[in-house]
């Protein structure tokens, strides 16, 4: 049994780091493998993560962490029984993938303005809470070419757009994702999408 693709890990900078790797053949990850992780800190102990399958030869492990600070560094040991398959380290602050925003809502009752709001996925005491920016993706269910991205570079988790920038009388979907420039993070996963019917009063034309 060998590791084909070494573990790569990302942290949500809150309580979970996710590590993924590939074995050289079909593997029952949860029964055959264990990922041990230990914070490099005085008197810390090793903790065990039981991996799950992620495709035939792929494994994924969700490492539970109490909190994360920039100084943190973890040692990682991948074991198959008594055999050490791989040894490495992981610094969560250098591999951050934010949590996805939630509760995306489209408010359509604001005088021909669409107000999209969502929730910041972090509690106020988390460092990322005040450092997230967002991308909002809006697309038409009827027209695949009608697909747009709005970059929200301010901290407030909301976006206002004129309803008239979208076509009237058809359904749209929106989703939102987040990233943090301060840690040069990757983008989060997209939030679940939300759907609404876009309708607004066309202005009267003067003849």
């Amino acid at each position: 049994m060998k590791v084909l693709q070494e573990p790569t890990c990302v942290s949500d900078y809150m309580s979970i780091s996710t590590c993924e790797w590939k074995m050289n053949g079909p593997t029952n990850c949860s029964t055959e493998l264990r990922l041990l992780y230990q914070l490099v800190f005085l008197l810390s102990e090793a903790h065990t993560c039981i991996p799950e399958n992620n495709g035939g030869a792929g494994c994924v492990c969700h490492l539970l962490m109490d909190d994360v600070v920039s100084a943190d560094n973890y040692t990682l040991d991948l074991w198959a029984g008594q055999q050490l398959l791989w040894k490495g380290s992981f610094k969560p602050s250098e591999h951050v993938k934010p949590r996805a925003p939630g509760n995306l809502t489209v408010h359509t009752n604001v005088s021909d303005t669409l107000l999209l709001t969502w929730s910041n996925p972090y509690p106020p005491d988390n460092y990322l809470y005040n450092h997230l920016t967002y991308a909002v993706n809006i697309w038409s269910e009827n027209d695949p070419a009608d697909f747009r991205i709005y970059n929200v570079t301010y901290l407030e988790p909301s976006l206002r757009i004129a309803a008239s920038t979208l076509k009237s009388g058809i359904s749209y979907r929106a989703r939102v994702r987040a990233w943090a420039q301060c840690y040069n993070t990757t983008w989060s996963e997209w939030s679940p999408s939300t759907k609404w019917h876009n309708s607004y009063r066309e202005p009267f034309e003067q003849h």
Partner: antibody, heavy 125, light 112 residues
């Protein structure tokens, strides 16, 4: 009541050995790191050794490294300090103390919040 | 090793008066989540040390509120707002950020 009781001290000749014990009660012994601190007559406090809750990680002062061994038996709620190749400068009162909670990924520290009554080790010919 | 330096080494105080002990470390004791790994202990004559303050400013269980700790990084202070006769003994600061844990030389508080 949370309590630590040391035993095993005594008079020993230079080059000899002693084994100190520290019995813990009133708390979940295996969840906490433990520490030994000593105090030579008329002197201040000196850290000797620490061990994590499971016993997998141990740390020693340079002055005792290679001569002293810290260990624990969590089934007996007992901490040990095996002292070999004793020297006159090891003469001191030895205290065990309850250290940080090591069950979480990041150990939770509340100080050395419980100390034993101390056991006296005298090394003399 | 981190060197801990206490001052003064001797502190005569009148009962009811305040007292202050300083402790300086040779490197920062600030690590994660804003915690400074600095404790204060009192050792009364013939007794084991007892914890007063942990993580620089947290009073240990059962410690009277006349004791308070402050400071961050390398400079720390233990204050007693009104000294009582039972407060006499040796006061030690200790860092537990890394091994070896190191103690200050001790400050002897005595009643005038």
């Amino acid at each position: 009541e949370v309590q630590l009781v040391e035993s095993g001290g005594g008079l020993e000749q230079p080059g000899g050995s002693l084994r100190l014990s520290c019995a813990g009660s009133g708390f979940t012994f295996r969840d906490y790191a433990m520490t030994w601190v000593r105090q030579a007559p008329g002197k201040g406090l000196e850290w000797v050794s620490s061990i994590s809750g499971s016993g997998s990680n141990t740390y020693y002062a340079d002055s005792v490294k290679g001569r002293f061994t810290i260990s624990r038996d969590n089934s007996k709620n007992t901490l040990y300090l095996q002292m070999n190749s004793l020297r006159a400068e090891d003469t001191a009162v030895y205290y065990c103390a309850k250290d940080r909670l090591t069950t979480a990924v990041r150990p939770s520290y509340y100080g050395l919040d419980v100390w034993g009554q101390g056991t006296t080790v005298t090394v003399s010919s | 090793d981190i060197v801990m330096t206490q001052s003064p080494l001797s502190l005569p105080v009148t009962p009811g008066e305040p007292a202050s002990i300083s402790c300086r470390s040779s490197q920062s004791l600030l690590y994660s989540l804003g915690y400074n790994y600095l404790d204060w202990y009192l050792q009364k004559s013939g007794q084991s040390p007892q914890l007063l303050i942990y993580l620089a400013s947290n009073r240990a269980s059962g410690v009277p509120d006349r004791f308070s700790g402050s400071g961050s990084g390398t400079d720390f202070t233990l204050k007693i707002s009104r000294v009582e006769a039972e407060d006499v003994g040796f006061y030690y600061c200790m860092q537990s950020l890394q091994t070896p844990y190191t103690f200050g030389q001790g400050t002897k508080l005595e009643i005038k």
